[in-house]
């Protein structure tokens, strides 16, 4: 499955929107830094494209879920959030088309299922952190920074997959 060129443009726009969403000086939030344990190994180059697409899809779906909550709506600018949702939704559509193309071709590798589970647990840790921090502005900024980093790493994987073709 070939992801359209617009997909990587959408990824860049998503990162730009995340950057624009910032609301407070980050320097006041240093002590709120947290190790969320991003499962970087699940986005390593050892994966075949067919195995990677569902993991990337899960990643973007979880980002969508995280920023779709009422707590998120209270934390961020509504206009930017709407643009953010639109970009994520388009990327999910692109990836879903690839997932559907791949159905029935091979058995779902156990490794892929483990990777999806690792991504879900990662987002559970993020959600728990926000809850423990009572959804404070700094907690949201730490999470935004973390999502920018993890999204960027997963985007780099998409680019490396495209360049290998």
């Amino acid at each position: 499955c070939d992801l359209p060129q617009t997909h990587s443009l959408g990824s860049r726009r998503t990162l730009m929107l995340l950057a624009q969403m910032r609301r407070i000086s980050l320097f006041s939030c240093l002590k709120d830094r947290h190790d969320f344990g991003f499962p970087q190994e699940e986005f390593g180059n050892q994966f075949q494209k067919a195995e990677t697409i569902p993991v990337l899809h899960e990643m973007i779906q979880q980002i969508f879920n995280l920023f779709s909550t009422k707590d998120s709506s209270a934390a961020w600018d509504e206009t930017l959030l709407d643009k953010f949702y639109t970009e994520l939704y388009q990327q999910l559509n692109d990836l879903e088309a690839c997932v559907i193309q791949g159905v029935g071709v091979t058995e779902t590798p156990l490794m892929k299922e483990d990777s999806i589970l690792a991504v879900r647990k990662y987002f559970q840790r993020i959600t728990l952190y926000l809850k423990e921090k009572k959804y404070s502005p700094c907690a949201w900024e730490v999470v935004r920074a973390e999502i920018m980093r993890s999204f960027s790493l997963s985007t780099n994987l998409q680019e490396s997959l495209r360049s290998k073709e």
Partner: antibody, heavy 121, light 107 residues
């Protein structure tokens, strides 16, 4: 390869102004903060301040607030440290280093080679 | 401001020795503590971050431990290239602060 390259050594007179630079390459410049550290001859490390190049937000150590200005030009991936009126006590080696911001990642993992500033009449 | 106090300020040791440097923060900083090595005329080099994580490319003879206010840098078997000055630095809150340094010299 990640690199921070600083401008060359400077010899200045008291009262003169100066702007030294730190150019980042091999990484996304706006994804990391840039910190400045002073080391006076034979002394330890002193943190001066930091900048977020994505929007030029800055934070200073109280010891350096008002004494120096930190700025950045993200279009050329460069951070700056400047003085409007140098004093003999500003004689030191100045280092820039990158910081991961709010991410749980190594702090000051890459450093510039240092810029030696000598202020003497 | 958070004060960082290193001890000792200097020490003499031989190649193969186990060396321990301690750093104390004036208030709890969790695990937000870094260790750097600096050789004369060179920029500092990150060894340990977040109290115990070994920076990529740093030999495994270097290790860090501690949390809260008390931290330790250990060199399990001192090598000739380890003779340098070591600094701790808190990254918990601004202003960031360094310890005064520990100079490791040849006995």
């Amino acid at each position: 390869e990640v690199q921070l390259v600083q401008s060359g050594a400077e010899v200045k007179k008291p009262g003169e102004s100066l702007k030294i630079s730190c150019k980042g390459s091999g990484y996304s410049f706006t994804s990391y903060w840039i910190g400045w550290v002073r080391q006076m001859p034979g002394k330890g490390l002193e943190w001066m301040g930091i900048i977020d190049p994505s929007d030029s937000d800055t934070a200073y150590s109280p010891s350096f607030q008002g004494q120096v200005t930190i700025s950045a030009d993200k279009s050329i991936s460069t951070a700056y440290l400047q003085w409007s009126s140098l004093k003999a006590s500003d004689t030191a080696m100045y280092y820039c280093a990158r910081h991961p911001g709010l991410n749980w990642a190594p702090d000051f993992d890459y450093w510039g080679q240092g810029t030696l500033v000598t202020v003497s009449s | 401001d958070i004060q960082m106090t290193q001890s000792p300020s200097s020490l003499s040791a031989s190649v193969g020795d186990r060396v321990t440097i301690t750093c104390r923060a004036s208030q709890s900083i969790g695990k937000s503590l870094n260790w750097y090595q600096q050789k004369p005329g060179k920029a500092p080099k990150l060894l340990i971050y977040f109290a115990s994580s070994l920076q990529s490319g740093v030999p495994s003879r270097f290790s860090g431990s501690g949390s809260g206010t008390d931290f330790t840098l250990t060199i399990s078997s001192l090598q000739p290239e380890d003779f340098a000055t070591y600094y701790c630095q808190q990254s918990y809150d601004f202003p960031l602060t360094f310890g005064q340094g520990t100079k490791v010299e040849i006995k």
